[in-house]
Amino acid sequence: ALLPAREATQFLRPRQRRAFQVFEEAKQGHLERECVEELCSREEAREVFENDPETDYFYPRYLDCINKYGSPYTKNSGFATCVQNLPDQCTPNPCDRKGTQACQDLMGNFFCLCKAGWGGRLCDKDVNECSQENGGCLQICHNKPGSFHCSCHSGFELSSDGRTCQDIDECADSEACGEARCKNLPGSYSCLCDEGFAYSSQEKACRDVDECLQGRCEQVCVNSPGSYTCHCDGRGGLKLSQDMDTCEDILPCVPFSVAKSVKSLYLGRMFSGTPVIRLRFKRLQPTRLVAEFDFRTFDPEGILLFAGGHQDSTWIVLALRAGRLELQLRYNGVGRVTSSGPVINHGMWQTISVEELARNLVIKVNRDAVMKIAVAGDLFQPERGLYHLNLTVGGIPFHEKDLVQPINPRLDGCMRSWNWLNGEDTTIQETVKVNTRMQCFSVTERGSFYPGSGFAFYSLDYMRTPLDVGTESTWEVEVVAHIRPAADTGVLFALWAPDLRAVPLSVALVDYHSTKKLKKQLVVLAVEHTALALMEIKVCDGQEHVVTVSLRDGEATLEVDGTRGQSEVSAAQLQERLAVLERHLRSPVLTFAGGLPDVPVTSAPVTAFYRGCMTLEVNRRLLDLDEAAYKHSDITAHSCPPVEPAAA
């Protein structure tokens, strides 16, 4: 029989225990006499033990000893040992040796007194100290047979009390992060790099992150140490949007009055100088030339009309030179030039007429004759029974070098209410009506209009050889741009090196600061893709602004409306960039106005076409778009539509 735990504990108190041991020894002698030397009955055994539980435990086993060794009377020593061991239930020891401090024999029972950390009836069960309040450990409690110990997470160490943990400062080791910055964290540490760099644990160093591999940019991406820049197809009419990653359309921010008049004929459409209109008159009846039209221009030079036969026969050319009408004529191979009348390139409408009379030609401005030239012959020339006359408007049907006096044929002018040979001309009217490019802006002012769809370029030289022979030639680029922009992004002026397909220099409007990644309206001066200077500009105010750029050996300045721009490079970088520019200037470069050719978008900060009015002065010389090596046909060389008046 087992005793309840509380009674067993009380039973084991030291004083009781000493009495119990005395009693046990007495009991052992009594058992010797009654049951070892003699054969005892259950009742006799009860008298030895003085209780039923021990008797009940003892007696069946006593009978087993008799069966095994014979009766007491056989005097078998094995029998005596067998019986003597029966009342001591700790022999053999039933308790677990590893976990037991002592085994105590009880009346028909035993009690295993366990060592610390062990439990169970036989002291064979490990006590999990970690299950209660984590064994007193601050972080990790490790249970083990009969014991436990505390430990700490990585980055912490065990305090001297064996229970609490304290943080290890890994940054105390200067090699922890190598080149990177070390930051201690509770139980850990972090190796930090500047934005745009990532820590390499193998190299223990900060390495540039190639953001371009992450596909951040919508179009073109350029990685740089610690950063990246996105570029959009400016020539395709796109610019960076607010997030500096995606692209958006370059939209006009100032509305220009670009409405056209369907009853007008624009003479400056063909940059090649070829006529905008070619008319073929043929008559059975001899006829004289009569031409009358209203005309408006700011252009000082160009061809209004040609009338006659082929270049070696008889013809006249009505042109404009220095703002005045000029008549060039060739009759039967003999050429003449006459110029007279008022300056008419004032931008206002006036009526001009050419009339072929019996023996002379009369030119009138607003019905007043300004030229009367005696001629010998007719403009209509007979051929196979028919009289022929070719009439071209805005150009001549042969090369301008074959004129009596060469002239730039390109004329940015406008014609309306035309009348050729007193005839009703439905042909031109119908053609003009369906072709807006043949129409003029309803209203124009002085200047040149860049529609945001093309450029002009010139072949100019920027090297200056001093008068004293043998000295080094110097260079200079000085640009003054009078601009009235219609959009916030576009190239004003640029140099292009065709051989290297590089953009040695550009001045442009841009609506963001690329390095600061900040939306801001600026004028940028750059050598190749590097911005040298920036200046803020109120680009969408509809007002005229003056952008001045001056570059020469050792200096580069950018001014907007008289205020000097901010330099974006160090003095050393500036010298290096100017040296690059000078190298380019020693090779052939083309001067671009209003845009760039098809260059990679990374060649310059801006590749978009300029939209708005602009006049350019380069090295103190006004650039005339009629004198360009090439001009996009939508750029008007000497006229610009005004800003649309604000709606009331």
Epitope: Q285, P286, N422
Partner: antibody
Framework: QIHLVQSGPELKKPGASVKISCKAS????????MNWVKQAPGQGLKWMGW????????TYTEEFKGRFVFSLDTSVTTAYLQISTLKAEDTATYFC?????????WGQGTLITVSS | ETTLTQSPSSLSVSTGDRVTITCITS??????MNWYQQKPGKPPKLLIS???TLRPGVPSRFSSSGSGTDFTFTISSTQPEDFADYYC?????????FGQGTKVEIK
């Protein structure tokens, strides 16, 4: 608006004469010559010639020399075609057309029928 | 005198068909060829003038090409209103001469 309006159809006997008119409006009559074109029934077009409206001088093609006369009355901006000694083969529609080297403006045509 | 040989004299086509008429001249006339359309009881209408020039208001389905002695007139996709007679006229030299004509009929 430029208009050329011709006189109405005529039925004539062989050997008779006929004079058809072409009234011009909408432009300076003397600036452009006047042409005459014949079209026999179911046949093609034939240029007969023209008249200088400045001088009144006519020009006839070989086929139409002799019995055909072009004339003018500039005061009423009208051109005339007269055919004398009519023959059956003169049966046709006759058109006037303004001279532009080619013909843009035409009269509506006058049908002359020659039949006994 | 410059004579014009126009062919075919007639052709039957369906609406939407392409029509090609040729005119060959006996002399080189440069590009001084004109093309006319004539409907019954009406005067001819100038469609294309010298230099293969389409006249104002004439639909773009009408076109012409050629220079020298060989000329072609084309209707790219015949419409119901295009069934008529067509003539070529040379205006290079006097006397002015017409082709014999081509009748474009409905098939």
């Amino acid at each position: 608006q430029i208009h050329l309006v011709q006189s109405g159809p005529e039925l004539k006997k062989p050997g008779a004469s006929v004079k058809i008119s072409c009234k011009a409006s909408g432009y300076t009559f003397t600036n452009y010559g006047m042409n005459w074109v014949k079209q026999a029934p179911g046949q093609g077009l034939k240029w007969m010639g023209w008249i200088n409206t400045n001088t009144g001088e006519p020009t006839y093609t070989e086929e139409f020399k002799g019995r055909f006369v072009f004339s003018l009355d500039t005061s009423v901006t009208t051109a005339y075609l007269q055919i004398s000694t009519l023959k059956a083969e003169d049966t046709a529609t006759y058109f006037c057309a303004r001279d532009e080297g080619w013909f843009v403006y035409w009269g509506q045509g006058t049908l002359i029928t020659v039949s006994s | 005198e410059t004579t014009l040989t126009q062919s075919p004299s007639s052709l039957s086509v369906s609406t939407g068909d392409r029509v090609t008429i040729t005119c060959i001249t006996s002399t080189d006339i440069d590009d001084d060829m004109n093309w006319y359309q004539q409907k019954p009881g009406k005067p001819p209408k100038l469609l294309i003038s010298e230099g293969n020039t389409l006249r104002p208001g004439v639909p773009s389905r009408f076109s012409s090409s050629g220079s020298g002695t060989d000329f072609t007139f084309t209707i790219s996709s015949t419409q119901p209103e295009d069934f008529a007679d067509y003539y070529c006229l040379q205006t290079d030299s006097v006397p002015l001469t017409f082709g014999q004509g081509t009748k474009v009929e409905i098939k």
